[in-house]
Amino acid sequence: ILGGREAEAHARPYMASVQVNGEHLCGGVLVAEQWVLSAAHCLEDAADGKVQVLLGAHSLSQPEPSKRLYDVLRAVPHPDSRPDTIDHDLLLLQLSEKATLGPAVRPLPWQRVDRDVEPGTLCDVAGWGIVSHAGRRPDRLQHVLLPVLDRATCNRRTHHDGAITQRMMCAESNRRDSCKGDSGGPLVCGGVLEGVVTSGSRVCGNRKKPGIYTRVASYAAWIDSVLA
């Protein structure tokens, strides 16, 4: 997260760290007791490493009573996701067992109504992604409030030049932005999960390259079918 601040500890109990061989790789969001939603491209970076999900964490390194690392029983990338595009960049991870819920671990309601968030709406994005262009990684969860950007502006040639489909949404990126390592994390508007950070190699913090988020409401049928 660029231009953000440290989050209040355990105030986002849905927040997950998708880890490979014990290292944070991507963000994720707990959407059901046994399921974490993330970004499909995160799996590509995992190679053959052991994928696990950390829940109940604020600090990645310090011991915390609510922290627990779960093995992944099943990884389900969206069937249409492809390495060369950010389309359908969603991944569902089934935990080896149901998460132990509590004040620091709780699923987040996700948007099912397929309607665009009003441009200008302030939404919260959180993650353990880099906090500087130099690539500094935080130990504690960061967050930032970002205004939603209308799709027409996001599709301008100097922005994303037509690449933003109806199944994506954008947020402003003027110094405050999601960045590398935040992919798969939640964009939360009005207490509801609206978007998932896409995992492209996009430049961060440049206002002409807005953050791109996969709209979960557009994938309600797929999410329901996997969770069923």
């Epitope: 209308d150 027409a152 599709n155 100097t158 030049d161 037509g162």
Partner: antibody, heavy 116, light 112 residues
Framework: EVQLQQSGPELVKPGASVKISCKAS????????MNWVKQSHGKSLEWIGD????????SYNQKFKGKATLTVDKSSSTAYMELRSLTSGDSAVYYC?????????WGQGTLVTVSA | DVLMTQTPLSLPVSLGDQASISCRSS???????????LEWYLQKPGQSPKLLIY???NRFSGVPDRFSGSGSGTDFTLKISRVEAEDLGVYYC?????????FGAGTKLELK
């Protein structure tokens, strides 16, 4: 399939105004800016300006400020350009073109002829 | 305003020839985001312009690979490796980096 269907040719008198339309189909109208381009007979292309269909926000080439006014009607997915105080120098083909994938999609053009 | 100067204005060719069109901008068209929004369009008589190349060297979908774009900063080139009859028309370079957006005067590709 993306289509931009423009209104038909116009023959107008000097000093009058004209409003030409560009109806979009095959995509969500509010997802892309609409731009307008002028081409005088046998000449090059000139960018007039653009409009954001979400909020009606516009940007104009200084040369066309006071000459062209861009508007949209979201309910009919139609962009409009009004040209006022017409002179013979405004006789041209006017194109609408969608931004996003550069200017990959163009209307067929509307010929405006200014003559007494 | 950024002036886009194309040369030549007329380019007589035989079918199968290589053709090269130059476009020079009056100032750098590298955008503040680091990208260069230089595009090439082809307009055939009685038709709307059609996009060929965007961001200097990227062919738009469906554009044959005999078309290639190159250049940087202020100097850009469009090359057609083997001219076919369907390639005849007027070619325009365009910059989308600075407002007002501007086109070159056009290069007419015609048969000798």
């Amino acid at each position: 399939e993306v289509q931009l269907q423009q209104s038909g040719p116009e023959l107008v008198k000097p000093g009058a105004s004209v409003k030409i339309s560009c109806k979009a189909s095959g995509y969500t109208f509010t997802d892309h800016y609409m731009n307008w381009v002028k081409q005088s007979h046998g000449k090059s292309l000139e960018w007039i300006g653009d409009i954001n269909p979400n909020n009606g926000g516009t940007s104009y080439n200084q040369k066309f400020k006071g000459k062209a006014t861009l508007t949209v009607d979201k309910s009919s997915s139609t962009a409009y350009m009004e040209l006022r105080s017409l002179t013979s120098g405004d006789s041209a083909v006017y194109y609408c073109t969608r931004e996003g994938a550069s200017f990959a999609f163009w209307g067929q053009g509307t010929l405006v002829t200014v003559s007494a | 305003d950024v002036l886009m100067t194309q040369t030549p204005l007329s380019l007589p060719v035989s079918l199968g020839d290589q053709a090269s069109i130059s476009c020079r901008s009056s100032q750098s068209i590298v955008h503040s985001n680091g990208d260069t929004y230089l595009e090439w369009y082809l307009q055939k008589p009685g038709q709307s312009p059609k996009l060929l190349i965007y961001k200097v060297s990227n062919r738009f979908s469906g554009v044959p690979d005999r078309f290639s774009g190159s250049g940087s900063g202020t100097d850009f080139t469009l090359k057609i490796s083997r001219v076919e009859a369907e390639d005849l028309g007027v070619y325009y370079c365009f910059q989308g980096s600075h407002v007002p957006l501007t086109f070159g005067a056009g290069t007419k590709l015609e048969l000798k």
